[in-house]
């Protein structure tokens, strides 16, 4: 008789999840020789231990603490780029500007990027059928708690000038309910962080509005200022041109770009 299995509203664990995490870990240590001594099997064991045999709606940050012990990777604290709802451009940027880092450029972020995972209470099985959806099922699910934990630690590590890339095409350019708005903003350390600089990325080619005046950006400025951190904002009117100028800063047409 097939055992009853909880049906969740979200997609199940990414297929070949263990193999994917292990392969990504090995690849990461090859790309980043400063991590050459990391034992990826041990990393996978700690990752697995965070959610296997646990109820997927009852995951805590504590469950990820063994894995977080690996999170002491030394990313330069003044070279951190946060992002909200504009991941692809942020990653394209750090691929060119190699001395800046998003969370997904760190080992733990790289391992989990775009993956879904969950287990089942009291069994060692990984659930490939369905996993809890943050809204419809529960917020304390393995994926959400993981990103909340690593995002908090990433923000806590930041110093000096922290940059954040925001999507100017969305109705809420700054969304208080995003990971950036609900976790990272509140975990920047005022004694270490001098300025948060927002880069608002425009979508339309003819969009010349100053999106730094958007009410949600003003809301972000207010939150940041209350935390004794300075705030600045820049419009990136042409993201394609912006990336081109990061690649070739000597180009004479790039004077007005960041």
């Amino acid at each position: 008789v097939p055992r009853w299995r909880q049906q969740w509203s979200g997609p199940g664990t990414t297929k070949r999840f263990p193999e994917t995490v292990l392969a990504r870990c090995v690849k990461y240590t090859e790309i980043h020789p400063e991590m050459r001594h990391v034992d990826c099997q041990s990393v996978w064991d700690a990752f697995k231990g965070a959610f296997i045999s646990k109820h997927p709606c009852n995951i805590t940050e504590e469950d990820y603490q063994p894995l977080m012990k690996l999170g002491t990777q030394t990313v330069p604290c003044n070279k951190i780029l946060l992002w909200s709802r504009i991941k692809d451009l942020a990653h394209q940027f750090t691929q060119v500007q190699r001395d800046m880092f998003t969370l997904e450029d760190t080992l733990l972020g790289y391992l989990a990027d775009d993956l879904t995972w969950c287990g089942e209470f009291n069994t060692s099985k990984i659930n490939y059928q369905s996993c809890p959806d943050w809204r419809k099922d529960c917020s304390n699910n393995p994926v959400s708690v993981f990103w909340k934990t690593v995002s908090r630690r990433f923000a806590e590590a930041a110093c000096d000038v922290v940059h954040v890339m925001l999507n100017g095409s969305r109705s809420k350019i700054f969304d208080k309910n995003s990971t950036f708005g609900s976790v990272e903003v509140h975990n920047l350390q005022p004694e270490k962080v001098q300025t948060l600089e927002a880069w608002v990325i425009h979508g339309g080619r003819e969009d010349s509005r100053d999106l730094c005046q958007d009410p949600t950006i003003k809301e972000l400025e207010s939150i940041i200022s209350k935390r004794n951190i300075q705030f600045s904002c820049k419009n990136i009117y042409r993201p394609d041109k912006f990336l081109q100028c990061v690649k070739n800063p000597e180009d004479s047409s790039c004077t007005s770009e960041i």
Partner: antibody, heavy 118, light 111 residues
């Protein structure tokens, strides 16, 4: 075959300075991380410092940070350890070592003795 | 006081099996490869085991390494007189941002 030959050791007074060199051959020096490891008389091995390949990043043991500087000259296939403000407890045989791709010390020199004494 | 803990000595008769333990923490052995080195007085140390259990070419298969959690061990089977040496475990330590060695274990082959 891989060869690592240290030089520059000797007797120095406390507070003095010394510069160790390591001449490397038999491998593509610029591709590999390089390290210094020491062994004090009657004691165990102690890692001192490492330097990355490419744009060099340096790493130091707490016991030498701020006093010792590791550097490399890829054109000369040479590794260096500049030792300042030397103390009696820095007395040791200093080994130059090549790191493998998983962080292991694959090849070692024969070592050079540094004695810090008044 | 070493970050990695090894017994100061181990011994066995010729042909016996000797095991050396190496105990650390999650900041070193837990998430990082363990390496083992053999050091004979007056010579350069020699790599015996890397990546927990891998032997470089030329190292006899009498030497084997293993790792579990925050501990590792080196086993020498079929002990021979030429195995008399000091043995050191090592690993990267995240909290120190550097390598750490064990205090070393002197292996003696009894007559």
């Amino acid at each position: 075959q891989v060869q690592l030959v240290e030089s520059g050791g000797g007797l120095v007074k406390p507070g003095g300075s010394l510069r160790l060199s390591c001449a490397a051959s038999g491998f593509t020096f610029s591709d590999d991380y390089m390290s210094w490891i020491r062994q004090a008389p009657g004691k165990g091995l102690e890692w001192v410092a490492s330097v990355s390949s490419g744009r060099p990043t340096t790493y130091y043991a707490d016991s030498v940070r701020g006093r010792f500087t590791i550097s490399r000259d890829n054109a000369k296939n040479s590794l260096y350890l500049q030792m300042n403000s030397l103390r009696a407890e820095d007395t040791a045989v200093y080994y130059c070592a090549r790191e493998g791709w998983s962080g292991e010390f694959t090849d070692w020199g024969q070592g050079t003795l540094v004695t810090v004494s008044s | 006081q070493s970050v990695l803990t090894q017994p100061p000595s181990a011994s066995g008769t010729s042909g016996q099996r000797v095991t050396i333990s190496c105990s650390g923490s999650s900041s070193n052995i837990g998430f990082h490869f363990v390496y083992w080195y053999q050091h004979l007085p007056g010579t350069a140390p020699k790599l015996l085991i890397y990546k927990n259990n891998q032997r470089p070419s030329g190292v006899p298969d009498r030497f084997s390494g293993s790792k579990s959690g925050n501990s590792a061990s080196l086993a020498i089977s079929g002990l021979r007189s030429e195995d008399e040496a000091d043995y050191y475990c090592a690993a990267w330590d995240d909290s120190l941002s550097g390598y750490v060695f064990g205090s070393g274990t002197k292996v003696t082959v009894l007559g």
